[in-house]
């Protein structure tokens, strides 16, 4: 449905508040270094312009595309070349190349200061003084640090952020009320950002077909009672939503997401019995709730899959007539029967099935050729099952921190060229799979663990893509989206790696470590562990454990000392010497 003015259409659909918030997110995700005030100014200008178009859709420039309008606005920023360097060259291009250029310059790891949380009273005062600016600042700070954050979901986070301050700034103990809520929002926000980053990587690096396959599998697990045609419609609509958000078309994305939520709720009888509560909520909560809704119960007496996909004499005919539809039906049927499998496993099975049909349907006796295709699935299913079993046992034995350390060592040995901060961040996140998933019963472990690992490994892939240093990482990241985890799992110690020169400065610590939070202190120790492995990749578990135990004792001792700084200086030298001796450096 064509509109005379796209900007007027979106303004009317979304309302002024959401329109302004989404434009701010869009601008902050594109120009990540620009000051808050500059973005607010640009947003206000765009909003005023949109209002003139609402009043008269035929007014000058109102017929321009949103990319043209927003791109023109971004290109008015005076300091573009000084701040962003070659990104300024985007402004010399015409749409759609200009928008593509801006997208390519989004930075997953922008050089921005860490967000430091002010005192609760300071935050509450700021909130009461100017609530609107306070909330806009939240959107801005999150958006610029997470340039692929799912914009309509960020509106939901902002709503919860506002609710937390509204409630807690009136509480008797403001800190006790607010801080846990902010911690929860921070953790959920990081997880949400990482999940969306995988969706965008899937679309941008592997194409729409890959994303649709993922969506068919996931939605079929979630809505096993829905017909294939219904799932296909949802997949098409969901793909459009995420393509728009990942492409920077945030107004269209939010609008279409609202339409999709409306459709799902209007048709919940033919989709899922679990949607009732979600559909009673207001829009932002409703969309979030639908996205997180639990899997519906599987229909009773689902027929054997083999009948249609192995035993039938019409397999090759059906495949040849409409390959993607037939494979989509296979994936749908397999996924709705297997909520206990990870989405990536289901996609591996579908790929194996596709490869078999490609080969067998050209053979002299196709049926004879593909008759045993389901037997090929067994090792594919057992591999993640065994891996999860082993790693959950290790997690239960070690606890989260030491499990993270085991993974740090494992991954540093696999890809020692990767930067230490990236190895620490990724391995810490990989290690969280234990507390996140190992508590689940067998039937929920694999979808929890392997799909979470896909999200974390994608973080490694996008960070590595910015400054590639390892061919092995590049290979695992680019060859197959669904085989990334097995690819990394299969990597052994990199025998080609030349150990890093020893640098005493890397292992010099100061009294400031004593005032750090437990989490920050862990990161310091884990950073040292990665550096140790980079210096001595052949060090045994026992050697590394001994050094790390000594290191923990050293920090504990010096943090209790009267003259902490002297203790760190003197005992630190001894520790470095002892560690060098223990590791034979």
């Amino acid at each position: 449905d064509a509109h005379k003015s796209e900007v007027a259409h979106r303004f009317k659909d979304l309302g002024e508040e959401n329109f302004k918030a989404l434009v701010l997110i869009a601008f902050a995700q594109y120009l990540q270094q620009c000051p808050f005030e500059d973005h607010v100014k640009l947003v206000n200008e765009v909003t005023e312009f949109a209002k003139t178009c609402v009043a008269d859709e035929s007014a000058e420039n109102c017929d321009k595309s949103l990319h043209t309008l927003f791109g023109d606005k971004l290109c008015t920023v005076a300091t573009l070349r000084e701040t962003y360097g070659e990104m300024a060259d985007c402004c010399a291009k015409q749409e759609p190349e200009r928008n593509e250029c801006f997208l390519q310059h989004k930075d997953d790891n922008p050089n921005l200061p860490r967000l430091v949380r002010p005192e609760v009273d300071v935050m509450c005062t700021a909130f009461h003084d100017n609530e609107e600016t306070f909330l806009k600042k939240y959107l801005y700070e999150i958006a610029r640090r997470h340039p692929y954050f799912y914009a309509p979901e960020l509106l939901f986070f902002a709503k919860r952020y506002k609710a937390a301050f509204t409630e807690c700034c009136q509480a008797a103990d403001k800190a006790a009320c607010l801080l846990p809520k902010l911690d929860e929002l921070r953790d959920e926000g990081k997880a949400s950002s990482a999940k969306q980053r995988l969706k965008c990587a899937s679309l941008q690096k592997f194409g729409e077909r890959a994303f649709k396959a993922w969506a068919v599998a996931r939605l079929s697990q979630r809505f096993p009672k829905a017909e294939f045609a219904e799932v296909s419609k949802l997949v098409t609509d969901l793909t459009k939503v995420h393509t728009e958000c990942c492409h920077g078309d945030l107004l269209e994305c939010a609008d279409d997401r609202a339409d999709l939520a409306k459709y799902i709720c209007e048709n919940q009888d033919s989709i899922s019995s679990k949607l009732k509560e979600c559909c009673e909520k207001p829009l932002l909560e409703k969309s979030h709730c639908i996205a997180e809704v639990e899997n519906d119960e599987m229909p009773a007496d689902l027929p054997s899959l083999a009948a249609d996909f192995v035993e039938s004499k019409d397999v090759c005919k059906n495949y040849a007539e409409a390959k993607d539809v037939f494979l989509g039906m296979f994936l749908y049927e397999y996924a709705r029967r297997h909520p206990d499998y990870s989405v990536v496993l289901l996609l591996r099975l579908a790929k194996t099935y596709e490869t078999t049909l490609e080969k067998c349907c050209a053979a002299a006796d196709p049926h004879e050729c593909y008759a045993k295709v389901f037997d090929e699935f067994k090792p594919l299913v057992e591999e993640p099952q065994n891996l999860i079993k082993q790693n959950c046992e290790l997690f239960e034995q070690l606890g989260e921190y030491k499990f993270q350390n085991a993974l740090l060592v494992r991954y540093t040995k696999k890809v020692p060229q990767v930067s230490t901060p990236t190895l620490v961040e990724v391995s810490r996140n990989l290690g969280k799979v234990g507390s996140k998933c190992c508590k689940h019963p067998e039937a929920k472990r694999m979808p929890c663990a392997e799909d979470y690992l896909s999200v974390v490994l994608n973080q490694l892939c996008v960070l590595h893509e910015k400054t590639p240093v390892s061919d092995r990482v590049t290979k695992c990241c680019t060859e197959s989206l669904v085989n990334r985890r097995p690819c990394f799992s299969a990597l052994e110690v990199d025998e080609t790696y030349v150990p890093k020169e020893f640098n005493a400065e890397t292992f010099t610590f100061h009294a400031d470590i004593c005032t750090l939070s437990e989490k920050e202190r862990q990161i310091k120790k884990q950073t040292a562990l990665v550096e140790l492995v980079k210096h001595k990749p052949k060090a045994t578990k026992e050697q590394l454990k001994a050094v790390m135990d000594d290191f923990a004792a050293f920090v504990e001792k010096c943090c209790k000392a009267d003259d902490k700084e002297t203790c760190f200086a003197e005992e630190g030298k001894k520790l470095v010497a002892a560690s060098q001796a223990a590791l034979g450096l």
Partner: antibody, heavy 121, light 110 residues
């Protein structure tokens, strides 16, 4: 008792539509392919098409486009939607259970009693 | 695809051995996807033989089937009074869309 019962037949004008139902009892429809066969008065059996356990449909070339087979496993029922009916579609319509699940083997081992469809003005 | 049955009608007596043939214009699927049915007036057909030679459940052993590819035979070794009916063959081919019935053989009392 294991049986199939067709319903929905009757008299219809040329160009009209009719939807036949085949309700199964005593067993679950979801484990076998279900077919439709018709028999004009005093004539032989004529295969219309079949629906597999997973919902794949296969039609005789003459039936493609005018006839549609569907199934609702929750109701344990199979349907035959007939459009643009002609005088030559006058027949007894049987639903039948195939030995196979995913395709038509031509071996229908359980049949309904049939429902009469008459197309005339 | 054509399924040709012969003869189209046949008269015989109780105790006789009767043979009906069915020929397809192309090979049936797996060379054996052929079934035989018996139909009595006012009743639905009843499956007698499937996969060319396998006896359906509850069918007397006097009925037997043979053949492969395009040529098949139904034999009733010793006709009983209840066997007078119309008999049809049905073939399954490489596509489920091509399943076809023969024109029928009417077996009557001599």
């Amino acid at each position: 008792e294991v049986q199939l019962v067709e319903s929905g037949g009757g008299r219809v004008q040329p160009g009209g539509s009719l939807r036949l139902s085949c309700a199964a009892s005593g067993f679950s429809l979801s484990s076998n392919a279900m077919g439709w066969v018709r028999q004009a008065p005093g004539k032989g059996l004529e295969y219309i098409g079949i629906i597999s356990v997973g919902g794949f449909t296969y039609y005789a070339s003459w039936a493609k486009g005018r006839f549609t087979i569907s199934r609702d496993n929750s109701k344990n029922t199979v349907y035959l939607q007939m459009n643009s009916l002609r005088a030559e579609d006058t027949a007894t319509y049987f639903c039948a259970r195939d030995r196979h699940g995913g395709d038509s083997s031509g071996a229908f081992y359980l049949w309904g009693q049939g429902t009469q469809v008459t197309v005339s003005s | 695809i054509q399924m040709t049955q012969s003869p189209s009608s046949l008269s015989a007596s109780v105790g006789d051995r009767v043979t009906i043939t069915c020929q397809s214009s192309e090979s049936v699927y797996s060379n054996n996807q052929l079934s035989w049915y018996q139909q009595k007036p006012g009743q639905p057909p009843k499956l007698l033989i499937y996969d060319a030679s396998d006896l359906a459940s509850g069918v007397p052993s006097r009925f037997s089937g043979s053949g492969s590819g395009t040529d098949f035979t139904l034999t009733i070794s010793s006709l009983q009074p209840e066997d007078f009916a119309t008999y049809y063959c049905a073939g399954g081919f490489s596509s489920s869309s091509d399943t076809a019935f023969g024109g029928g053989t009417k077996l009557t009392v001599l």
